[in-house]
């Protein structure tokens, strides 16, 4: 009979985590909207976190937000200001592996 251990090992065997596309650097204008895309795939579905200049991104109502997408995650910044300049990094993990990608917003 199939045991839970065997099911677990089958899951482990099929697990993967891939960065499908590196994040692009973005140069944009004051007041515009910028979108950064974290394109990853994996099994089990990865958890994705966003960092700015090495610190967790602070979401701001109606201005800065991130959400899950079919390809991973999207970070959107509206009404851009010069203070938004910096390194943005997405970090994805499926519990076993970690992948990350970094882009510069100017």
């Amino acid at each position: 009979p199939t045991s839970s251990w065997n099911i677990s090992s089958e899951l482990n065997k099929d697990s993967y985590l891939t960065l499908d596309e590196p994040m692009n650097n973005i140069t944009t204008s004051l007041g515009q909207t910028a979108e950064l895309h974290c394109k990853v795939s994996g099994n089990p579905p990865p958890t994705i976190r966003w960092f700015k200049n090495d610190a967790p991104v602070v979401q701001e109502p109606r201005r800065l937000s991130f959400r899950s997408t079919i390809y991973g995650s999207r970070l959107r910044i509206r009404n851009l200001d010069t203070t938004d300049t910096g390194y943005f990094q997405c970090v994805a993990t499926n519990g076993k592996e970690v992948v990350s990608s970094t882009g510069v917003l100017f």
């Epitope: 700015k52 200049n53 090495d54 610190a55 967790p56 390194y87």
Partner: antibody
């Protein structure tokens, strides 16, 4: 070993110009923000300007905007600060610093500083 | 620009004392705060980054903490070589603004 070495400081008259250099070694120069920070005699640290050498994007403090220009030569691993229309209040030690992203979110390496004196 | 209000501006302490310096950010800067030590005639040296991470080679008597927009640098047992000026800096927003500095003097 990561190193930043500034040069080009000196005595200049008000209204004059000076160009500071920051020679970098020991790391991938184009991948890091390079900043200039200054410190007037007996005062605190004041951020001046930054450049991302890979794209030549720049940003300035309001106090120097329109007078100072930051640039970089990736073939020489060197950043520059061109200072025009200098004023007495620009008198300071000028430091270049590397922003050490991804693991160390701070200015992890600094140069030794170069003194700029604006006086008649 | 974001303001980093540092206090006290100076303090007198003795070797072995526990010393605490605080910085308050004018708005959220996440955990992107660093602390530097500067001695006369020298460039600043990084002590703490990401609010509480000890930089390589820095003695463990230095520590950092965060509570919302308040950040603290603590020296658990002051040593003779620790008499210097300390600065906080936020790095979340560009430009990376500094606090006014705290001079730690010998009592």
């Amino acid at each position: 070993e990561v190193q930043l070495v500034e040069s080009g400081g000196g005595l200049v008259q008000p209204g004059g110009s000076l160009r500071l250099s920051c020679a970098a070694s020991g790391f991938t120069f184009s991948s890091y923000f390079i900043h200039w920070v200054r410190q007037a005699p007996g005062k605190g640290l004041e951020w001046v300007a930054l450049i991302y050498p890979d794209t030549d994007d720049t940003y300035y403090a309001d106090s120097v905007k329109g007078r100072f220009t930051i640039s970089a030569d990736t073939s020489k691993n060197t950043a520059y600060l061109q200072m025009n229309s200098l004023r007495a209040e620009d008198t300071a030690v000028y430091y270049c610093a590397r922003y050490g992203y991804l693991g160390v979110g701070a200015f992890d390496y600094w140069g030794q500083g170069t003194l700029v004196t604006v006086s008649s | 620009d974001i303001q980093m209000t540092q206090s006290p501006s100076s303090l007198s302490a003795s070797v072995g004392d526990r010393v605490t310096i605080t910085c308050r950010a004018s708005q959220s800067v996440s955990s992107a705060v660093a602390w530097y030590q500067q001695k006369p005639g020298k460039a600043p040296k990084l002590l703490i980054y990401s609010a509480s991470s000890l930089y390589s080679g820095v003695p463990s008597r230095f520590s950092g903490s965060r509570s919302g927009t308040d950040f603290t640098l603590t020296i658990s047992s002051l040593q003779p070589e620790d008499f210097a000026t300390y600065y906080c800096q936020q790095l979340y927003w560009t430009p990376g603004t500094f606090g006014q500095g705290t001079k730690v003097e010998i009592k």
